[in-house]
């Protein structure tokens, strides 16, 4: 179906996707609703997942997921987390949406999640250093396993953006 | 407390060069983006642009590019600006500003350093 | 490039009134937006960021508004020290520009 149908009810919308892949859902209802992700996005539960193949700063990555109407990564499930994991590449880590911008090792999640340290999954010793702020999912090989790391903020990193689902 | 303190006023010739020191005190200075502002006698502020104090990575305005150079010495904590081939029009006060953690808006502020470039 | 348009260039005001300095730019900048202070002869002061958060230290009169493509900083009750030129600056996208200043005088 194409996206420009699915739109004519919904023309006021202000676009940012131009392009949406979508998936129809059984409702009661006899109206059809539409579930879609802007194309080259991952779908998983009801959000959206761009993971970003160019390098930026924490800010500068989260400036990019703001302008596609998405922020960094808020990991609330280790489902969720496991379903990003799958959809990374080994070599490369990834800017996520938790910070800790005053050094105190007070992390704070971008859209006011609260941080909760029994559901956490930093890599063995760390976080490790208070001037490291961000945080990235990255790979180790011994233990083979993906994990969080705090890194320095400037420093380049690829991302993860998500938004929710759109509806049509 | 946080202080970003720069070198004094400069009084040069058009062609020469000039170097502009800021030197951060109060913070971790690998953790915040330096940048440098320009405020022409009687006029508004002007980005130049900013360095990136963990990457070394400069980023310059247009109409900065060229001759105009930011460096760091982090040892030190300390941020340059140099301006080659001084022109008349460089005459103006240039402040150096931390760049903040998340939002980069100029949190704090040098106190400004007075370069006149006359003949 | 995103264009900042600062108005007005100049205001005169009395202590005690309440004034509004407007900042119009080019395109969405989604609230990434600081108003500075500058007294002659010293550095800028950060006022407020995100376009409504008040720096530390700044005083309750002072407010900041808007989102899109329109912003204001609002002064109530106008203090002596108060005057001076104030500059909007988006942190949108780069080059991060200033609007061109308003200078709010003494009547």
């Known amino acids: 179906q194409k996206y420009s149908q699915l739109l004519e009810k919904k023309t006021t919308k202000e676009l940012v996707h131009t392009t949406l892949e979508c998936v129809k859902k059984n409702m009661p209802v006899e109206e059809t609703a539409w579930s879609c992700c802007p194309k080259n996005w991952k779908s998983f539960s009801s959000n959206c997942y761009f993971i970003s193949t160019e390098s930026a700063s924490w800010q500068d990555s989260e400036k990019d997921c703001a302008r596609m109407e998405a922020h960094l990564l808020v990991i609330n499930t280790q489902e969720e987390q496991d379903f990003i994991f799958q959809n990374l590449q080994e070599e490369s880590a990834y800017f996520v949406g938790l910070s800790d911008p005053e050094g105190q090792r007070h992390w704070q999640w971008v859209d006011q999640t609260p941080y909760n340290e029994s559901s956490t999954f930093w890599h063995p010793r760390e976080p490790s250093d208070p001037n490291e702020r961000c945080v990235v999912l990255n790979f180790r090989k011994s233990p083979k396993r993906w994990g969080w790391n705090d890194v320095n903020c400037l420093g380049p990193q690829r991302s993860v953006c998500e938004m929710m689902k759109i509806h049509l | 407390q946080i202080q970003l303190v720069q070198s004094g006023p400069e009084l040069k010739k058009p062609g020469e060069t000039v170097k502009i020191s800021c030197k951060a005190s109060?913070?971790?200075?690998?953790?915040?983006?330096m940048n440098w502002v320009k405020q022409a006698p009687g006029k508004g502020l002007k980005w130049v642009g900013w360095i990136n104090t963990f990457t070394g990575e400069p980023t310059y305005v247009d109409d900065f590019k060229g001759r105009f150079a930011f460096s760091l010495e982090t040892s030190a904590s300390t941020a340059y600006l140099q301006i080659n081939n001084l022109k008349n029009e460089d005459t103006a006060t240039y402040f150096c500003a931390r760049g903040n953690f998340r939002y980069y808006y100029f949190d704090y502020w040098g106190q400004g350093t007075t370069l006149t470039v006359s003949s | 490039d995103i264009q900042m348009t600062q108005s007005p260039a100049s205001l005169s005001a009395s202590v005690g009134e309440t004034v509004t300095i407007t900042c119009r730019t080019s395109g969405n900048i989604r609230n990434y937006l600081a108003w500075y202070q500058q007294k002659q002869g010293k550095s800028p002061q950060l006022l407020v960021y995100n376009a409504k958060t008040l720096a530390d230290g700044v005083p309750s009169r002072f407010g900041g508004s808007g989102s899109g493509t329109q912003y204001s900083l609002k002064i109530n009750s106008l203090q002596p020290e108060d005057f001076g030129n104030y500059y909007c600056?988006?942190?949108?996208?780069?080059?991060?520009?200033f609007g061109g200043g308003t200078k709010l005088e003494i009547k």
């Open positions: 600056q988006h942190f949108w996208s780069s080059p991060y520009t």
């Open positions: 109060g913070y971790t200075f690998t953790n915040y983006g």
